[in-house]
């Protein structure tokens, strides 16, 4: 059953799975933050066999995989903001 749809609520996922997907079967992971008419965060896993699965964001295994993506996306040292002192 295809689990990803465009609905009137603008959520992509109709149902979510917590079933573990081994990393070797994963092509990419799409993280959609809540907003744009969808009240919840959605995680879409694109598998190498071209199938698409919506995953429960609370599933422990997907959280670890998301950490890999977050680590990489946060890997540039933040530039400090210097406020000019007013005499």
């Amino acid at each position: 059953v295809l689990e990803v749809y465009y609905t009137s609520l603008r959520c992509r996922c109709v149902q979510e799975s917590s079933v573990f997907i081994p990393r070797r079967f994963i092509d990419r992971i799409q993280i959609l933050p809540r907003g744009n008419g969808c009240p919840r965060k959605e995680i879409i896993v694109w598998k190498k066999n071209k199938s698409i699965v919506c995953v429960d964001p609370q599933a422990e295994w997907i959280q670890r995989m998301m950490e890999v993506l977050r680590k990489r996306s946060s890997s540039t040292l933040p530039v400090p903001v210097f406020k000019r002192k007013i005499p």
């Epitope: 890999v68 977050r70 946060s74």
Partner: antibody, heavy 119, light 112 residues
Framework: QVTLKESGPGILQPSQTLSLTCSFS??????????VGWIRQPSGKGLEWLAH???????YYNPALKSRLTISKDTSKNQVFLKIANVDTADTATYFC???????????WGQGTTLTVSS | DVLMTQTPLSLPVSLGTQASIFCRSS???????????LQWYLQKPGQSPKLLIY???NRFSGVPDRFSGSGSGTDFTLKISRVEAEDLGVYYC?????????FGGGTKLEIK
């Protein structure tokens, strides 16, 4: 078990290009979250990170050397390559490749290959 | 760049005693996702480095429980509760939070 092995020319003259190969087994760079990086160590000195490449071909370089570095991979052959252009005597070092597995940075290392730059 | 400063440079110890190695980063290495990617390695003479501790305090697979890591923000410590002969070598801290990834200068653990 996971193994990595570096190979290189051993000796180069200044201004030549260094080509290094990292051949690995028991993991694949086609797997989500996997990466391979290069680190070097001049004799008797500390470790310097050079570059790494991820499963999806995203690449990161040490800014101090970025203009001279090129990292690439051949996923089907389980190999990662590093090129360093315009070498100098300061590039004389042992060069290591190491695996990245998600948030374990460099959890398994190769034995290293030694480069001497001399005219 | 994040500069990693290790102390002491050399640490003479007696076998069976505790050893502590310190590492300080020039910037906080807590990523904005809340994680701190601070690792410790041991490099024995003529060998490549081996991972001991990841994410500040987690022992890597096969690492004896006499090794422990602690710290937060910019200050980190590696403790070896009872030093054994096989623990001798150079210890490096490493930060993988921000590019360029950087290593400490190393601490040589040697017999007193």
């Amino acid at each position: 078990q996971v193994t990595l092995k570096e190979s290189g020319p051993g000796i180069l003259q200044p201004s030549q290009t260094l080509s290094l190969t990292c051949s690995f087994s028991e993991f694949s760079l086609s797997v989500f979250g996997m990466g391979v990086g290069w680190i070097r160590q001049p004799s008797g000195k500390g470790l310097e990170w050079l570059a790494h490449i991820w499963w999806d071909d995203e690449k990161y370089y040490n800014p101090a050397l970025k203009s001279r570095l090129t990292i690439s991979k051949d996923t089907s052959k389980n190999q990662v390559f590093l090129k360093i252009a315009n070498v100098d005597t300061a590039d004389t070092a042992t060069y290591f490749c190491a695996r990245i597995d998600g948030y374990y940075d460099f959890d398994y290392w190769g034995q290293g290959t030694t480069l001497t730059v001399s005219s | 760049d994040v500069l990693m400063t290790q102390t002491p440079l050399s640490l003479p110890v007696s076998l069976g005693t505790q050893a502590s190695i310190f590492c300080r980063s020039s910037h906080s290495i807590v990523q904005d996702n809340g994680n701190t990617y601070l690792q410790w390695y041991l490099q024995k003479p003529g060998q490549s480095p081996k991972l001991l501790i990841y994410k500040v305090s987690n022992r890597f697979s096969g690492v004896p429980d006499r090794f422990s890591g602690s710290g937060s923000g910019t200050d980190f410590t590696l403790k070896i509760s009872r030093v054994e002969a096989e623990d001798l070598g150079v210890y490096y801290c490493f930060q993988g939070s921000y590019v360029p990834y950087t290593f400490g200068g190393g601490t040589k653990l040697e017999i007193k």
